[in-house]
């Protein structure tokens, strides 16, 4: 069914997400030691490293056109904190209408 | 045609349970495309969201900071219904409390509204 | 919480009228932002979405516009019917808050 071709789809984006940190962090000097907030997949999209002060925006990931194909793709903010990542905002639910592969409710 | 049918009390002490239910017709409380919302209104503080809840393979509740304290919703699957509970209730409580389900098209918006409840907390 | 203001609080208008009314976001809101028309005594009713978006069965003559903090709601040829209070609410982030209303009475 369409979940199981969309678990398909988030697994592929996973692996080229953690590609695409790998290739951020050689460009920005970055790592395991270094401040700021390492790159991320959280179980939707992709979040390029950041340094501390940053705000990151992503649209919400293309897959949500299958569940919503109306969906004029909103977007999500985090920001890097001292503290690390804070929260999506707004969450996934507001902001793209599913939130079926977000670890956090 | 979806409908909300409201039901419950129109008078509540001060420091009980205000108890309310929104019985579903039309659509199902386990839908996977809706959300079940609880709005209030006062003169004092116009139309005010107080919460939601929602099945995407489980439960999910979000709700007011201003009543986080004291609200439970809770479906209840066997009647396609879910409820409304707010504990500690002050004459501040009184409104019309409306039951809504949410639809997402773009962003959530609230397409069908139940009938409303007036509820008075008084001694 | 994102406050929701809006303006005039009351209008008062005549049949055939077109009047706009204003609502504005505290923060950007992108066009996460809904219009309901409420009448004496009766729940509100969704007229438009997603700021611009017509809810079916609405007539034509009810428009939006706006993204970011500031938002119209038109009504082209103002009938009989119209004459209500009017409520923006933002979705872009709970809790989904409602502005004050704007009430539409009879000149």
């Known amino acids: 069914g369409s979940m199981a071709h969309s678990d398909g789809i988030f697994k592929k984006e996973q692996a080229m997400c953690l590609e695409k940190i790998q290739r951020a962090n050689e460009l920005m000097g970055f790592n395991d030691s270094s401040p700021g907030c390492p790159g991320m997949w959280d179980n939707i999209t992709c979040w390029k490293p950041a340094h501390v002060g940053e705000m990151v925006l992503v649209s919400c990931p293309e897959l949500f056109r299958i569940f919503n194909p109306d969906q004029d793709m909103g977007v999500v903010s985090r920001n890097c904190t001292e503290d690390g990542w804070s929260e999506p905002f707004p969450h996934y639910f507001d902001a793209c209408g599913f939130d079926e592969y977000e670890s956090e409710t | 045609q979806v409908q909300l049918q409201q039901s419950g009390p129109g008078l509540v002490k001060p420091s009980q349970t205000l108890s309310l239910t929104c019985a579903i017709s039309?659509?199902?409380?386990?839908?996977?495309?809706?959300?079940w919302n609880w709005i209030r209104q006062s003169p004092s503080r116009g139309l005010e969201w107080l919460g939601r809840t929602y099945y995407r393979s489980k439960w999910s509740n979000h709700y007011a900071v201003s009543v986080k304290s004291r609200i439970t919703i809770n479906p209840d699957t066997s009647k396609s219904q879910f409820s409304l509970q707010l504990n500690s209730v002050t004459p501040e409580d009184t409104a019309v409390y409306y039951c809504?389900?949410?639809?997402?098209?773009?962003?959530?918006?609230?397409?069908?509204w139940g009938q409303g409840t007036l509820v008075t907390v008084s001694s | 919480d994102i406050q929701m203001t809006q303006s005039p609080s009351s209008l008062s208008a005549s049949v055939g009228d077109r009047i706009t009314i204003t609502c504005r976001a505290s923060q950007s809101i992108s066009r996460y932002l809904n219009w309901y028309q409420q009448k004496p005594g009766k729940a509100p009713k969704l007229l438009i979405y997603?700021?611009?978006s017509l809810q079916s069965g609405i007539p034509s003559r009810f428009s939006g516009s706006g993204s970011g903090t500031d938002f119209t709601l038109t009504i082209n040829s103002l009938q009989p019917e119209d004459f209500a209070t009017y409520f923006c609410q933002q979705s872009y982030s709970p809790p989904f808050t409602f502005g004050p209303g704007t009430k539409v009475d009879i000149k």
């Open positions: 809504a389900r949410g639809t997402w098209k773009q962003l959530w918006f609230l397409d069908h």
């Open positions: 039309g659509d199902s409380v386990s839908s996977n495309s809706a959300t």
């Open positions: 997603a700021a611009s």
